[in-house]
Every structure is written in structure tokens, then in C-alpha cells.
């Protein structure tokens, strides 16, 4: 990526990292706007499986794992990036290594939830402090997750589908800070690893994923009144270890792999038209990015 | 009937390529780990490369990487093994593996025959 | 690399004898160890998954144990049908490797 400074404007779609033939560095931001990519600072070290947020406009990549022809290294890495100065610094690194990680942030805090290190299939879960530059374990999930999906709504961080070490699985659960504990909440109505899991309205989505036979399109919401699941309609493409996140009050969708292609393909979610369209495409294709949205 | 078919093995001379197919029937590649592992005359087990079905993420033995490339088609229900820069080294017969998960670690369940790679001037 | 390091490298023993064999992990592997019975020009096939787990259709004859880093593969009345070779296997660290193996030959 270059190394000048990023311009400065406000709400852009960060890619970073991912996956094809070997794990990748780059940095990328969308301007839904008008259409343009950015080409930014490299991450320090190449990740896939790593997942992405923003805390107080800055951008945090967390976990993943190097995927590279010297070797294989899950990251316990935590790095942040500056948009200000298009410049990427180390911060503090999580308790182990957590490679196909989830992520979600409740009050300024980010939550990393399971993932792997090697063979183990973590349940463990830890937030990080930014004014601190701490990491503290929280209590473990009810389940060990790897492709996990994870989102926050009402302040309340909830843990989607993934993978056991056996199983794929369609169940979730929700943390609750303060009680500091799990509980299980309704199923999915499908098997889902590697699935895409927002928020939107009130409503937790996870779209695509893979049912332990095939990458899928379908998408599926749930409502936290109802405490259900509800079908909304497809992806125009199969796709799983796929980016997701939610802009100005629709969804887009990054890339992924469909168990045959590295996608490209950006496609956007509208609510209203419960539609998907093809937005953009990525300047290549690739799976497990992490993906998070500037703040105003 | 569970089973994998490999075949695309034979003579090569050094530094040439070969592309092993590995087709499965009974299960679909799509839900498994596909694992590729060699043997060299009178010698021991080797892994060579996997691929993961729900990420596309591949894995290479340090002596292999950057000169073979696993893949698989779905369609078709058939892992490859594109085998490039080849050395006398790389003689062995070539086994493609069903990999079963269970608490994380992958073993390989359902085997090949195997398909002979000789490497020779 | 993770050395699984296999003993003995051949052994002899008649039809109705305990046989054992071990492996040695360089470096904590967990029960991440598999067992395998290879014929000559055959593949392998797997007998043991997890240190200690029988995989479906094996014979209950083949049992296998762990004790740290030593994983042990046990064949408790050897048949005709079992003279082979045998190599365990470490998948917990990146890259999977194998034991040198054990070739079981008749007495």
C-alpha cells in the first residue's frame, strides 16, 4: 500500500487482510459515495482470519493468522490504525493466539471472541481496553467458536454459528457485561461457519457461511423481540470467511470464498427493497478479511 | 462406497510439472479437508498440502511450498495437486486423504491408492 | 517442526503376542496423535484418531494411550492379518508430521 496520507473523509468501508494463495497485507477503503477504492498502509505483518473494528476513529485489526510459503503463524496481534496518518502501530496482544476470530465493541471496549491456535478451538473471550492498552479475560462462551460470527446491539454482544472442531454449528449465544455470562439464544434455522453477522434495524443478520457440505447464499435475521429467526432474501453469490459490515442502513458483504473462487464481488443489502445488488468489485479476489466502517 | 481415485502420475525429468487428480466418489470434497501425502520408495509418510473446504485456505510442507499448488473443483468433486520445478526428491507415491475433524485436529480417514511420481534424467 | 520420534524401528513377534509400540512427541502435540496400519503397496489406514480413540471398523485389539508426550499404540493378541507397518502421527502444530514407523514382521 502507499504510504501518504489517506484523505480525509469520513465513512469509508476499511478491507483489511484476507486470503488468496497466501495471507495478505493490504489495506483498502471504499467509498460508497462515489464508487472509488483507496490503497493504504500495509498491515506490519500479512493476516487472514482476522476481524476488524473501530473504536474512536481508529481502526483496529485483530487476530488471524500469517498463511505464508515460509509457515503458518496464528496472531495474537492487536494493530491500529490511524486514518489520519495512514500509519499502522502494535498495540497490546490478546492472551493467545485467536485465528478466525469475532469481534464486536460495547462501550469503547472490543470484545475478541474465540478462534483458534492450532488444534484448539477457543471459547474464551477477552476485551481490550484502548485508554489502557490492556487485555482482561471476560467469561468463556457456552460453546468453542472458530468462524464465528459476532455483533453488538443494545449493548449486548452475541456470538453466531461457527465452528466446534467437530461441528459446524447453527446456535448462538448472547453475553451480557454486566453479569459477566453467556446464554444461549434461539438457533439459526441453518448450519453456519464463516458466515457474515451484522446489525441493521434492530436486527442481528448472518449471511452466507458454510453448512459443513456447502458455502451458502441464503441470509437469515434475528429479531430480539420476537426472539426468531426469519429468512430474508439470498445473496446473488455462495460465499463464506466473507467481510461484512453495515453503511448508512444497508449491508455490504466482501468477498469470500464460494468452495471453488476467491470472490471479488461487493454486493449491498437495502432493507426496504430487501434486495441484494453487485455495488463494486475488490481490486482482487479473497476470504477472511476484516472489514469495519469509520465513524462520522 | 467411500472413495478417492488418484491418478496423473509417471516419468518427469527434472524441473518439469505434472498435475495429479485425486476424484472422489461416495462423500462430496466439498465437505472435507483434502490432504495430500507422499511416500518415497522404502521410506516413511509425508505431508505434502491440505486445503480447507470453508475458507479456501491452503497449507504446504516448507518442501514443497511456492513449487505445488493444491486446489479443487467441486464440480467435478476432484482435488488436484499441480506439481511445478520438480526434483529427484520429489519420487515418491503421492496419496490424496479425506481429512475427519474431530475436537479440531484433522486424521485422515479415507485414502487413495496412491499414483507413483518418478523424477528422472 | 514437531519430531514424532517411533520405537522400535522393526519388531518380531508370533500370532497371539502383545505388541507395542511408541512414539515420541519433541514437544507437547496434546492428543492430537493418530495411529496408522500401512500393508506394502497399499495405502495406510487409520486405526486410532485422538490418542486413544477407536476409529469405526478397527478391531478392538488396537488400543492406544498417551502419557504426556509418549503415545502408545497396543495390539493386545496379534493376528496374521496385522503384520504391517505402523505410523503415528502428530496434526496439533503446523506442519503434520509422522514417526519414522514400525515394521511388525513375523518371528
Known amino acids: 500500500g502507499s504510504m501518504g496520507h489517506a484523505p480525509k473523509v469520513g465513512r469509508l468501508i476499511y478491507t483489511a487482510g484476507g486470503y488468496f494463495r497466501q495471507s495478505l497485507s493490504y489495506l483498502e477503503a471504499y467509498n460508497p459515495s462515489d464508487g472509488t477504492w483507496l490503497d493504504l498502509a500495509d498491515l506490519q505483518v500479512p493476516r487472514s482470519g482476522l476481524a476488524g473494528c473501530v473504536v474512536g476513529g481508529l481502526l483496529y485489526a485483530v487476530g488471524g493468522r500469517n498463511n505464508s510459503p515460509d509457515g503458518n503463524t496464528d496472531s495474537s496481534a492487536l494493530d491500529c490504525y490511524n486514518p489520519m496518518t495512514n500509519q499502522w502501530s502494535p498495540c497490546a496482544p490478546m492472551s493467545v493466539p485467536r485465528n478466525r476470530i469475532g469481534v464486536g465493541v460495547i462501550d469503547g471496549h472490543i470484545y475478541a471472541v474465540g478462534g483458534s491456535h492450532g488444534c484448539i478451538h477457543h471459547n474464551s473471550v477477552e476485551r481490550y481496553e484502548p485508554e489502557r492498552d490492556e487485555w482482561h479475560l471476560v467469561a468463556p462462551m457456552l460453546t468453542r467458536r472458530i468462524g464465528v460470527g459476532v455483533a453488538v446491539l443494545n449493548r449486548l454482544l452475541y456470538a453466531v454459528g461457527g465452528f466446534d472442531g467437530t461441528n459446524r454449528l447453527n446456535s448462538a449465544e448472547c453475553y451480557y457485561p454486566e453479569r459477566n455470562e453467556w446464554r444461549m439464544i434461539t438457533a439459526m434455522n441453518t448450519i453456519r461457519s464463516g458466515a457474515g453477522v451484522c446489525v441493521l434495524h434492530n436486527c442481528i443478520y448472518a449471511a452466507g457461511g458454510y453448512d459443513g457440505q456447502d458455502q451458502l447464499n441464503s441470509v437469515e435475521r434475528y429479531d430480539v423481540e420476537t426472539e426468531t429467526w426469519t429468512f430474508v432474501a439470498p445473496m446473488k453469490h455462495r460465499r463464506s470467511a466473507l467481510g461484512i459490515t453495515v453503511h448508512q442502513g444497508r449491508i455490504y458483504v466482501l468477498g469470500g470464498y464460494d468452495g471453488h473462487t476467491f470472490l471479488d464481488s461487493v454486493e449491498c443489502y437495502d432493507p426496504d427493497t430487501d434486495t441484494w445488488s453487485e455495488v463494486t468489485r475488490m481490486t482482487s479476489g479473497r476470504s477472511g478479511v476484516g472489514v469495519a466502517v469509520t465513524m462520522e | 462406497e467411500v472413495q478417492l481415485v488418484e491418478s496423473g502420475g509417471g516419468l518427469v525429468q527434472p524441473g518439469g510439472s505434472l498435475r495429479l487428480s485425486c476424484a472422489a466418489s461416495g462423500f462430496a470434497i466439498s465437505a472435507s479437508s483434502i490432504h495430500w501425502v507422499r511416500q518415497a520408495p522404502g521410506k516413511g509418510l509425508e505431508w505434502v498440502a491440505s486445503i480447507d473446504p470453508e475458507t479456501g485456505e491452503t497449507l504446504y510442507a516448507k518442501s514443497v511450498a511456492g513449487r505445488f499448488t493444491i486446489s479443487a473443483d467441486t464440480s467435478k468433486n476432484t482435488a488436484y495437486l499441480q506439481m511445478n520445478s520438480l526434483r529427484a526428491e520429489d519420487t515418491a507415491v503421492y496419496y490424496c486423504a479425506r481429512a475427519y475433524a474431530g475436537d479440531g485436529v484433522y486424521y485422515a480417514d479415507v485414502w487413495g491408492q496412491g499414483t507413483l511420481v518418478t523424477v528422472s534424467s | 517442526d514437531i519430531q514424532m520420534t517411533q520405537s522400535p524401528s522393526s519388531l518380531s513377534a508370533s500370532v497371539g503376542d502383545r505388541v507395542t509400540i511408541t512414539c515420541r512427541a519433541s514437544q507437547s502435540v496434546s492428543s492430537a496423535v493418530a495411529w496408522y496400519q500401512q500393508k506394502p503397496g497399499k495405502a495406510p489406514k487409520l486405526l486410532i484418531y485422538?490418542?486413544?480413540s477407536l476409529y469405526s471398523g478397527v478391531p478392538s485389539r488396537f488400543s492406544g494411550s498417551r502419557s504426556g508426550t509418549d503415545f502408545t499404540l497396543t495390539i493386545s493378541s496379534l493376528q496374521p492379518e496385522d503384520f504391517a507397518t505402523y505410523y503415528c502421527q502428530q496434526s496439533y502444530s503446523f506442519p503434520s508430521t509422522f514417526g519414522q514407523g514400525t515394521k511388525v514382521e513375523i518371528k
Open positions: 485422538s490418542a486413544s
